[in-house]
C-alpha cells in the first residue's frame, strides 16, 4: 500500500514517543562517535519535520523515501570527516548505494568508554530531573555500542528501565531495589545484542535463503501444531522484519512487526496454544513474549517422516517440482518432530538431505541410491551430543570460572593470532554455556547449547572481521554458517604459530587490582593466562593451572599486605621469575 | 641448615589411606610453599602437591580430588593426606620447600629437599 509520505504514514503507525525513540536508535547506531546532543538536535530536526509531512502529505520534500531523509540528515553533521574519517565520503553517494555505506561502517567493536554505573541516588536524581532525557541516554549508549541492536526490543528494554527507577527512586532501599533490576536488564540486553548480530550476519552474509532455512527450523520446532503454510508466512513475514532491522531500516521494522504479533494474536488457534498469555500483554511486552514463547506440545501421533522423504516414489518429483518447497517441508517435518535438536542441527540434516537428493536424483536408480539417507544423519546427530556431555561434565567438575579457563587455553592454543581481549570475551562467553544450558535435562541441552555457541562464535567472526589476523578464524566463519561450532570444534593447535616474545611489563600487577569487582579481577586473571598461552603455547594443562593457583596466591597475599605496592612489585618479580624458570619462558 | 623430615610412608591395600607429615626446622617457611613430590622406580621425580602460604593449593591431576595438602605453620610443618590409593601412587615421597611462594610446582622453585619416604600401594 503506497503511501504519498512514507514519513508521515511511520509517524502515525509508531506515535511521536516511539518514532522518535526510534531515530534516536538508527542514528546513534549509524554515527555511533556524535555526541548524544547532537543525535537529539538531530532527531528533533526530524520530528518537527515529519509533523509538517503529516499536516500535509504532499509538503515540500515529504514524498522523499525515509533513507534518502535520514542520510541527507546524517550528511549535515560538521564534524563527520574529522570523527568518522572515510565513511564521510558515504555522502558523496546516491541512495541506495549510501545507505549500504553507511551499514558497512557499523562498527561491532567501537572505541567508547566503558559504561561506569554511577551512584543510586544520582540516578534516580537525573532521573527525576528529566525523564524524558534520562531515557533517551539509555537508548543512545545501547544503540551506539550495539549497532545492530534489535530497535523494536530496544524500546521494550527502555520501557523496563523506566519502569524500574520509577519503582526503585521511591524504595526505601534504592540500590537493594535498583542494583538486581540492572544487573538483568544489562544481562539480558548483552544477550539480545548477540543473538540479534547473529541474524543480521545470517541474512548478511548468507542471504535470504540462510536466514529463512533458520526461521523455518526454529518456527517448527515452536509451533508443532500449526501447518506448513502457516509456518511459510511467519517465516516470510519474520524475515522481512529482521531485513529491515538490519538494514537500518528501524521505522519500518518496528511497525511491521506490530503487525505480525498482531497477526499472530489474531490466529493462535492456528499457530500455538502457548500464546494466549503473551496475547493479552501490550504491543512490547506482546511481542517480546512471542519471541521468547517456550515450544508448544507435538501433535500426537505423528507419521514417520520416511513415509514421504524416503519410501516415496515421488521424492525426486517433489523435489525437482520445486526444491526450496520441498526442502522447506522436509525442515519443517523434522524440526516439529525435534525439539530436542539445535537449529544448526536441523539445517545440517536438511543440507546432507539436499546433498543426497542432487546427487541420487541425477542416479540411475534414485530411489536405491538415497534409501539409506537417514543413516547418514547419525554421525551428525551424535557428535554434538558426545560434545555436550563432556562439556558438561567438565563444566560440572570446575564450575564456571575454571571451566572458562579451560576454554581460555584451548581456544588460545587454536586461534592465537587473535587479539587477547577478544579471546577473553569469547572464551568467557563460551563457558557459560555450562551455567546457561547444563542444568537442563538432555531433551534440552542441545538446542540450548548448540544454538547459544553459534551466537557466541558469531562476536568471534566479527570481532575478527573487522580486524583479520586468523585465517583459520576466517575459514570456520565464512565457509559455513551452519558448521562453525564444528569447525572451531575440529581446530587443533596452531603448530604454525611463533610464540609472542616474553614481556615482563604484561605480567605486571598494581595494587588497584584489589578494589576491582570480582569479575574484574577474574578478566585480569583470564587475560594474564591467555598471554601465557601465546608466549608458551606448548605448556601443559597442569602448568598453567599451577601457574594461576600462584598468581591468585599472590594477588591475594599483597592484596591483604599493609604497603600493597611495594608487595606487587616485589612479589611480581619473584613471581614472574619462578614462572619463568617453570615454564622456560 | 634447613632440615625437612617425612614420616608417615608404608604399606598400604589399594583404596585405602596413608597420611604424610613433613617437619621443618632450622628455617622459617612462613612465607613460601611447601608440598610434595614423589619418584616411581625407573621415573623422573613428579609433582604432586603444594600449598602456599596463603593456604592457596595446587595438585596433580593424578591426584585430585584423592589427596589433600595442608599446613601447620606455627609448627613448621606440611601434610599429606591420601585417600583412595592406587597401585599407581607407589613411589618415594619427598618433600619440597620453596624460595618463595611461587613456581613450586616444578623442580626449579624447590630451595630444599627432604629426604623422602617410602609409600606401597598393594592391590
Known amino acids: 500500500d503506497a503511501h504519498k509520505s512514507e514519513v508521515a504514514h511511520r509517524f502515525k503507525d509508531l506515535g511521536e514517543e516511539n518514532f522518535k525513540a526510534l531515530v534516536l536508535i538508527a542514528f546513534a547506531q549509524y554515527l555511533q562517535q556524535c555526541p548524544f546532543e547532537d543525535h537529539v538536535k538531530l532527531v528533533n530536526e526530524v520530528t518537527e519535520f515529519a509533523k509538517t509531512c503529516v499536516a500535509d502529505e504532499s509538503a515540500e520534500n515529504c514524498d522523499k523515501s525515509l533513507h534518502t531523509l535520514f542520510g541527507d540528515k546524517l550528511c549535515t553533521v560538521a564534524t563527520l570527516r574529522e570523527t568518522y574519517g572515510e565513511m564521510a565520503d558515504c555522502c558523496a553517494k546516491q541512495e541506495p548505494e549510501r545507505n549500504e555505506c553507511f551499514l558497512q561502517h557499523k562498527d561491532d567493536n567501537p572505541n567508547l568508554p566503558r559504561l561506569v554505573r554511577p551512584e543510586v541516588d544520582v540516578m534516580c536524581t537525573a532521573f527525576h530531573d528529566n525523564e524524558e532525557t534520562f531515557l533517551k541516554k539509555y537508548l543512545y549508549e545501547i544503540a551506539r555500542r550495539h549497532p545492530y541492536f534489535y530497535a523494536p526490543e530496544l524500546l521494550f528494554f527502555a520501557k523496563r528501565y523506566k519502569a524500574a527507577f520509577t519503582e526503585c527512586c521511591q524504595a526505601a532501599d534504592k540500590a537493594a531495589c535498583l542494583l538486581p533490576k540492572l544487573d538483568e536488564l544489562r544481562d539480558e540486553g548483552k544477550a539480545s545484542s548477540a543473538k540479534q548480530r547473529l541474524k543480521c550476519a545470517s541474512l548478511q552474509k548468507f542471504g535470504e535463503r540462510a536466514f529463512k532455512a533458520w526461521a523455518v527450523a526454529r518456527l517448527s520446532q515452536r509451533f508443532p501444531k500449526a501447518e506448513f503454510a502457516e509456518v511459510s508466512k511467519l517465516v516470510t513475514d519474520l524475515t522481512k522484519v529482521h531485513t529491515e532491522c538490519c538494514h537500518g531500516d528501524l521505522l519500518e521494522c518496528a511497525d511491521d512487526r506490530a503487525d505480525l504479533a498482531k497477526y499472530i494474536c489474531e490466529n493462535q488457534d492456528s499457530i500455538s496454544s502457548k500464546l494466549k498469555e503473551c496475547c493479552e500483554k501490550p504491543l512490547l511486552e506482546k511481542s517480546h513474549c512471542i519471541a521468547e514463547v517456550e515450544n508448544d506440545e507435538m501433535p500426537a501421533d505423528l507419521p514417520s517422516l520416511a513415509a514421504d522423504f524416503v519410501e516415496s516414489k515421488d521424492v525426486c518429483k517433489n523435489y525437482a517440482e520445486a526444491k526450496d518447497v520441498f526442502l522447506g517441508m522436509f525442515l519443517y517435518e523434522y524440526a516439529r518432530r525435534h525439539p530436542d535438536y539445535s537449529v544448526v542441527l536441523l539445517l545440517r540434516l536438511a543440507k546432507t538431505y539436499e546433498t543426497t537428493l542432487e546427487k541420487c536424483c541425477a542416479a540411475a536408480d534414485p530411489h536405491e541410491c538415497y534409501a539409506k539417507v537417514f543413516d547418514e544423519f547419525k554421525p551428525l546427530v551424535e557428535e554434538p551430543q558426545n560434545l555436550i556431555k563432556q562439556n558438561c561434565e567438565l563444566f560440572e567438575q570446575l564450575g564456571e570460572y575454571k571451566f572458562q579457563n579451560a576454554l581460555l587455553v584451548r581456544y588460545t592454543k587454536k586461534v592465537p593470532q587473535v587479539s587477547t581481549p577478544t579471546l577473553v570475551e569469547v572464551s568467557r562467553n563460551l563457558g557459560k554455556v555450562g551455567s546457561k544450558c547444563c542444568k537442563h535435562p538432555e531433551a534440552k541441552r542441545m538446542p540450548c547449547a548448540e544454538d547459544y555457541l553459534s551466537v557466541v562464535l558469531n562476536q568471534l567472526c566479527v570481532l575478527h572481521e573487522k580486524t583479520p589476523v586468523s585465517d583459520r578464524v576466517t575459514k570456520c566463519c565464512t565457509e559455513s554458517l551452519v558448521n562453525r561450532r564444528p569447525c572451531f570444534s575440529a581446530l587443533e593447535v596452531d603448530e604454525t604459530y611463533v610464540p609472542k616474545e616474553f614481556n615482563a611489563e604484561t605480567f605486571t600487577f598494581h595494587a588497584d587490582i584489589c578494589t576491582l569487582s570480582e569479575k574484574e579481577r577474574q578478566i585480569k586473571k583470564q587475560t594474564a593466562l591467555v598471554e601465557l598461552v601465546k608466549h608458551k603455547p606448548k605448556a601443559t594443562k597442569e602448568q598453567l593451572k599451577a601457574v594461576m593457583d600462584d598468581f591468585a596466591a599472590f594477588v591475594e597475599k599483597c592484596c591483604k599486605a599493609d604497603d600493597k605496592e611495594t608487595c606487587f612489585a616485589e612479589e611480581g618479580k619473584k613471581l614472574v621469575a619462578a614462572s619463568q624458570a617453570a615454564l622456560g619462558l | 641448615e634447613v632440615q625437612l623430615v617425612e614420616s608417615g610412608g608404608g604399606l598400604a591395600q589399594a583404596g585405602g589411606s596413608l597420611r604424610l607429615s613433613c617437619a621443618a626446622s632450622?628455617?622459617?617457611?612462613?612465607?613460601?610453599?611447601m608440598g610434595w613430590f614423589r619418584q616411581a622406580p625407573g621415573m623422573e621425580r613428579e609433582f604432586v602437591a603444594i600449598?602456599?602460604?596463603?593456604?592457596?593449593?595446587t595438585y596433580a591431576d593424578s591426584v585430585e580430588g584423592r589427596f589433600t595438602v595442608s599446613r601447620d605453620i606455627a609448627k613448621n610443618t606440611v601434610y599429606l593426606e591420601m585417600n583412595s590409593l592406587k597401585p599407581e601412587d607407589t613411589a618415594v615421597y619427598s618433600c619440597?620447600?620453596?624460595?618463595?611462594?611461587?613456581?613450586?610446582?616444578?623442580?626449579?622453585?624447590?630451595?630444599?629437599w627432604g629426604q623422602g619416604t617410602q609409600v606401597t600401594v598393594s592391590s
Open positions: 619440597a620447600a620453596g624460595a618463595s611462594d611461587y613456581g613450586c610446582y616444578h623442580t626449579s622453585g624447590i630451595s630444599y
Open positions: 632450622g628455617g622459617t617457611f612462613s612465607n613460601s610453599c
Open positions: 600449598i602456599r602460604s596463603t593456604g592457596h593449593t
